[in-house]
Interface confidence: low
């Protein structure tokens, strides 16, 4: 069955953009002008998952790369990583749970909750140029709110 996808960029609530930091990590920092071209473009795919009125299951791939954000346990802690996949088989509607995030829209802000680890969210630090990570708290120091920009 076909998977619907759209291309977008994400900025955190502090307007930090997301860029590649090495081959398998994202970091968040403020970009301006031509530097905005460095930000990663996501291919957000609408996939199968737990349904509810306010949560939409999505997978977040990097456009034109066979990399997807995934959530795994490392040293007993839920961890965000970029995982390489076979481009012939991805994206697909029935993505493995580690690739699935519940996109939650509240007051025009988006949160991305791990389907594998409920109440853990894609997060950024207040500090500049720090890795994007999976955080277990909302409303604290770390930022879990994002805005999405449509990319053609």
């Amino acid at each position: 069955a076909p998977v619907r996808s759209l291309h977008c960029t994400l900025r955190d609530a502090q307007l930090k953009s997301l860029v590649m930091s090495g081959p398998y990590e994202l970091k968040a920092l403020h970009l301006q002008g031509q530097d905005l071209e460095q930000q990663v473009v996501f291919s957000m795919s609408f996939v199968q998952g737990e349904e509810s009125n306010d949560k939409i299951p999505v997978a977040l791939g990097l456009k034109a790369k066979n990399l997807y954000l995934s959530c795994v346990l490392k040293d007993d802690k839920p961890t965000l990583q970029l995982e390489s996949v076979d481009p012939k088989n991805y994206p697909k509607k029935k993505m493995e749970k580690r690739f699935v995030f519940n996109k939650i829209e509240i007051n025009n802000k988006l949160e991305f909750e791990s389907a594998q680890f409920p109440n853990w969210y894609i997060s950024t630090s207040q500090a500049e140029s720090m890795p994007v990570f999976l955080g277990g708290t909302r409303g604290g120091q770390d930022i879990t709110d994002f805005t999405m920009q449509f990319v053609s």
């Epitope: 069955a1 076909p2 619907r4 996808s5 759209l6 291309h7 609408f46 199968q48 349904e51 939409i56 509607k93 996109k103 449509f150 990319v151 053609s152």
Partner: antibody, heavy 120, light 107 residues
Framework: QVQLVQSGAEVKKPGASVKVSCKVS????????IEWVRQAPGKGLEWIGE????????NYNEKFKGKATITADTSTDTAYMELSSLRSEDTAVYYC?????????????WGQGTLVTVSA | DIKMTQSPSSMYASLGERVTITCKAS??????LSWFQQKPGKSPKTLIY???RLVDGVPSRFSGSASGQDYSLTISSLQYEDMGIYYC?????????FGGGTKLEIK
């Protein structure tokens, strides 16, 4: 509120083409899929295809490939469907509708329909 | 293509009666199913999406359910304004396909 306003009825000769427009207001045009559906007189509904105006992604029903061409103009918030090589069996009401990009929303808003009559 | 077999094709029911219309999908559609109502000379109106979610403004007497690949639309207490043609739609797999329609008339 959300509105989809379609162009008026058309009468065309067999072999001609027609371009139906669907002007959208009340939401961000680029973000949501526009669907095209047809209904022949006294018949049911048939899905033709869809476009996501923000990035130009298009999906067609194979049956209508070569018959329908779907486009969108984000500067005017208008979607178009052109039908070519018209035949009498293309006589139908053509509807545009919008669905949220979140996929599990289903069709939510519809245009008023455009009657295309193909007659010699 | 996925075939949506809708039944009955037409029916009469009395005001206040409970009415159920069904659609059977020829294969798994992952619950990606909508229901529409259409009145003569008018555009379709969406009632329900994703099997059971009511569109804003649709009366609560309308409900949707699923059992395997059988999908149902139920009107708990038929009102005069409910007459029209009802269609189901699967939007899981291209091409999206509609059921053949159920014409609902008042007895």
């Amino acid at each position: 509120q959300v509105q989809l306003v379609q162009s008026g009825a058309e009468v065309k000769k067999p072999g001609a083409s027609v371009k139906v427009s669907c002007k959208v207001s009340g939401y961000t045009f680029s973000r949501y899929w526009i669907e095209w559906v047809r209904q022949a007189p006294g018949k049911g509904l048939e899905w033709i295809g869809e476009i996501l105006p923000g990035n130009g992604n298009i999906n067609y029903n194979e049956k209508f490939k070569g018959k329908a061409t779907i486009t969108a103009d984000t500067s005017t918030d208008t979607a178009y469907m052109e039908l070519s090589s018209l035949r009498s069996e293309d006589t139908a009401v053509y509807y545009c509708s919008t669905i949220y990009y979140d996929y599990d929303q289903g069709f939510t808003y519809w245009g008023q329909g455009t009657l295309v009559t193909v007659s010699a | 293509d996925i075939k949506m077999t809708q039944s009955p094709s037409s029916m009469y029911a009395s005001l206040g009666e409970r009415v159920t219309i069904t659609c059977k999908a020829s294969q798994d559609i992952d619950r990606y199913l909508s229901w529409f109502q259409q009145k003569p000379g008018k555009s379709p109106k969406t009632l329900i999406y994703r099997v059971k979610r009511l569109v804003d403004g649709v009366p609560s007497r309308f409900s949707g359910s699923a059992s395997g690949q059988d999908y149902s639309l139920t009107i708990s207490s038929l009102q005069y304004e409910d007459m029209g043609i009802y269609y189901c739609l699967q939007y899981d797999e291209f091409p999206y396909t509609f059921g053949g329609g159920t014409k609902l008339e008042i007895k």
